[in-house]
């Protein structure tokens, strides 16, 4: 067990051009507060998970009113540290999110209004018991300077707060299998502390906070007996000695979740989904207030000023759940139009548009017919991110500006010769054929196959095709 401590040194405009506008004004005074969220590990999954290591909310800072015309200075900060207690081992590697919130104090209907000013995040390695680490993070035009450390709470010591030290019972040596606690040579390592509530008779641990069951016992605290009477139930792992193990009651039988929590079985044991105002393995811990920072991922806590009143988390877009602990997959909505690629960056949604489209959601068809003229009597046909011109006879090209060669497609059949003409094309048919495209054979008796040659035109004469 131990405490992660965060000290905010300054929050104000970062270096470089484009200083941000002050978040407060004479008409709308405001004050800042901060929220920190900690997650174990450096993996990508950690970024999507709730604040598994804990979260904390600072006090409100002093009220600030912008001086008209003055650039935004470093803003007045709340007093004190943000402290995030952790019960189990310090993971050594962790992810953090620090949010800067603005509380507007104008004449708001229904109380003050909150808005997120900046959010910074990072992944770090940190040994418990070490010195303060300093950091600078930028969010847009804002800059946040802070320090942090992790310290163990007695009797825990070590870089992970897993070694426990007790004063020596005898002046000369520590107990069997226990070493002196360097650098506190006058103290000894204490035995491992298993998960709270782990059955002392049926459970044991090899790591702090663990609870592993002896054969014949199951459940998260090794308090549920295992029956070996029958092997019909699919529940339970197989055992070399008994052939199979069948828990008498299933993990959720009798609902181990208190205070109206709902139970769901997991591969190892069970999981409780707690109603608002309760948390813990079995929803046994009550009295959560907004001061406990129960809302994850930038959720804003409302109500719950005292343990008897429930709090409500107002989740930012992209998150849901009673504690804003679940991420919404915004890309599943396919917000990027016209074949655009969706990227959910967490803090924002981005679309990578196909050629011919633009806009935040690829909604702007750049190649549509608006404002485009097809020359020489052509008409514009749009759709699918491209426009094309349907050209009048004798013209071609993207905008119908090119004079088409009507003979290019070899329109005269049966060896007829094609001649370009101002009004189209003319086919000079080979002997034995007639028609606009020389498509009709001439019968030996001089009669043609349907249709007949127009009056006054002999078979074999050139025919104009209009």
């Amino acid at each position: 067990a131990g405490v992660f401590e965060l000290q905010i040194h300054s929050f104000g405009p970062g270096p470089g051009p484009g200083a941000p506008r002050s978040p407060c004004s004479a008409r709308l005074p405001c004050r800042l507060f901060f929220r920190v969220c900690l997650k174990p590990g450096l993996s990508e999954e950690a970024a999507e998970s709730p604040c598994a290591l804990g979260a904390a909310l600072s006090a409100r800072g002093p009220v600030y009113t912008e001086q008209p015309g003055a650039p935004a200075p470093d803003l007045p900060l709340p007093d004190g540290l943000l402290q995030v207690p952790f019960r189990d081992a310090w993971p050594g590697t962790f992810s953090f999110i620090i949010e800067t919130w603005r509380e507007e104090l104008g004449d708001q209907i229904g109380g003050p209004a909150w808005s997120l000013l900046a959010r910074v995040a990072g992944r770090r390695r940190l040994a418990a018991g070490g010195p303060w680490a300093r950091d600078i993070q930028r969010a847009g035009a804002w800059e946040l300077r802070f320090s942090y450390r992790a310290r163990c709470e007695p009797p825990a010591v070590g870089t992970a707060c897993t070694r426990l030290c007790r004063p020596r019972s005898a002046p000369s040596r520590c107990g069997p299998g226990l070493r002196p606690c360097a650098p506190l040579e006058d103290e000894c390592e204490a035995p491992l502390v298993c998960r709270a509530g782990c059955s002392p008779e049926h459970g044991f641990c090899e790591q702090p906070g663990e609870c592993r069951c002896l054969e014949g016992w199951t459940g998260p605290l090794c308090t549920v007996p295992v029956s070996t009477s029958s092997c019909l139930s699919p529940r339970g792992p197989s055992s070399a000695t008994t052939g199979c193990l069948v828990p008498g009651p299933g993990p959720c039988d009798g609902n181990p979740c208190a205070n109206g929590g709902s139970c769901s079985e997991t591969p190892r044991s069970f999981e409780c989904t707690c109603p608002r105002g309760f948390y813990g393995l079995r929803c046994e811990v009550s009295g959560v207030t907004c001061a406990d920072g129960p809302c994850f991922n930038g959720g804003l806590c409302v109500g719950g000023a005292d343990p008897d009143s429930a709090y409500i988390c107002h989740c930012p877009p992209g998150f849901q759940g009673s504690n804003c602990e679940k991420r919404v997959d915004r890309c599943s909505l396919q917000p990027c139009r016209n074949g655009g690629l969706c990227l959910d960056l967490g803090h924002a949604l981005r679309c990578r548009c196909r050629a011919g489209f633009a806009g935040p959601r690829c909604e702007h068809d750049l190649d549509d017919c608006a404002g485009r003229a097809c020359a020489n009597g052509g008409t514009c046909v749009e759709g699918g991110g491209a426009h094309r011109c349907s050209c009048a006879l004798g013209f071609g090209g993207r905008d119908c500006r090119e004079r088409a060669d009507p003979c290019a497609a070899r329109p005269c059949a049966h060896g007829g010769r094609c001649y370009a003409h101002f009004s189209g094309l003319v086919c000079a048919c080979a002997p034995g054929y007639m028609g606009a495209r020389c498509e009709f054979p001439v019968h030996p008796d001089g009669a043609s196959a349907l249709p007949a040659a127009p009056p006054g035109l002999r078979p074999g004469d050139p025919q104009r095709y209009l």
Partner: antibody, heavy 121, light 107 residues
Framework: EVQLVESGGGLVQPGGSLRLSCAAS????????IHWVRQAPGKGLEWVAY????????YYADTVKGRFTISRDNAKNSLYLQMNSLRAEDTAVYYC??????????????WGQGTTVTVSS | DIQMTQSPSSLSASVGDRVTITCRAS??????LNWYQQKPGGAVKLLIY???RLHSGVPSRFSGSGSGTDYTLTISSLQPEDFATYYC?????????FGGGTKVEIK
Amino acid sequence: EVQLVESGGGLVQPGGSLRLSCAASGFTFSDYGIHWVRQAPGKGLEWVAYISSGGYTIYYADTVKGRFTISRDNAKNSLYLQMNSLRAEDTAVYYCARGDYEDIFYTMDYWGQGTTVTVSS
Amino acid sequence: DIQMTQSPSSLSASVGDRVTITCRASRDITKFLNWYQQKPGGAVKLLIYYTSRLHSGVPSRFSGSGSGTDYTLTISSLQPEDFATYYCQQGNTLPWTFGGGTKVEIK
């Protein structure tokens, strides 16, 4: 409660100018894109213009492009539509409407009551 | 531009009736179709977005369906307050365009 209140409408001669305003309250104005939509007497709805939450993306209908200018002041929770070179066919009730968060759907989820613009000599 | 064609342009119905209004787009709008209600006073309200999602506070008797170019708004049991004009709007490609409207009148 989300509220949008339009103002600035009135009678103007063809070729004249008018500036409409839309005052927003009940939500974080700087998080949302806003649209102007109009409705000519006895006719249906016609989208006019759109401005994104930060003012970086602006779109206009072809019928008003080059004559109308949409703008916003996030510090004042206000939206504006500057209308120049007005024509008789611009006569309509003008509504401002809030877009959805992050413009995933390009909906107009809350509307004002409208302000009437009459262009006549 | 994408043209939105609404039908019918008007209809008469009684309280309790099931009413269906259709909207056809001139090309695929990939479900980015929204429905609005306008009361005679001029107030416009969003009813349904993204084809079938009910906007907050809208009664469940309103529902939407469709895909591609064809979309439908259904009122399962018409109530007195539902007599109004209904518009569809596509949110797929600029410019945003509305259907011509369907006026639902009392029979």
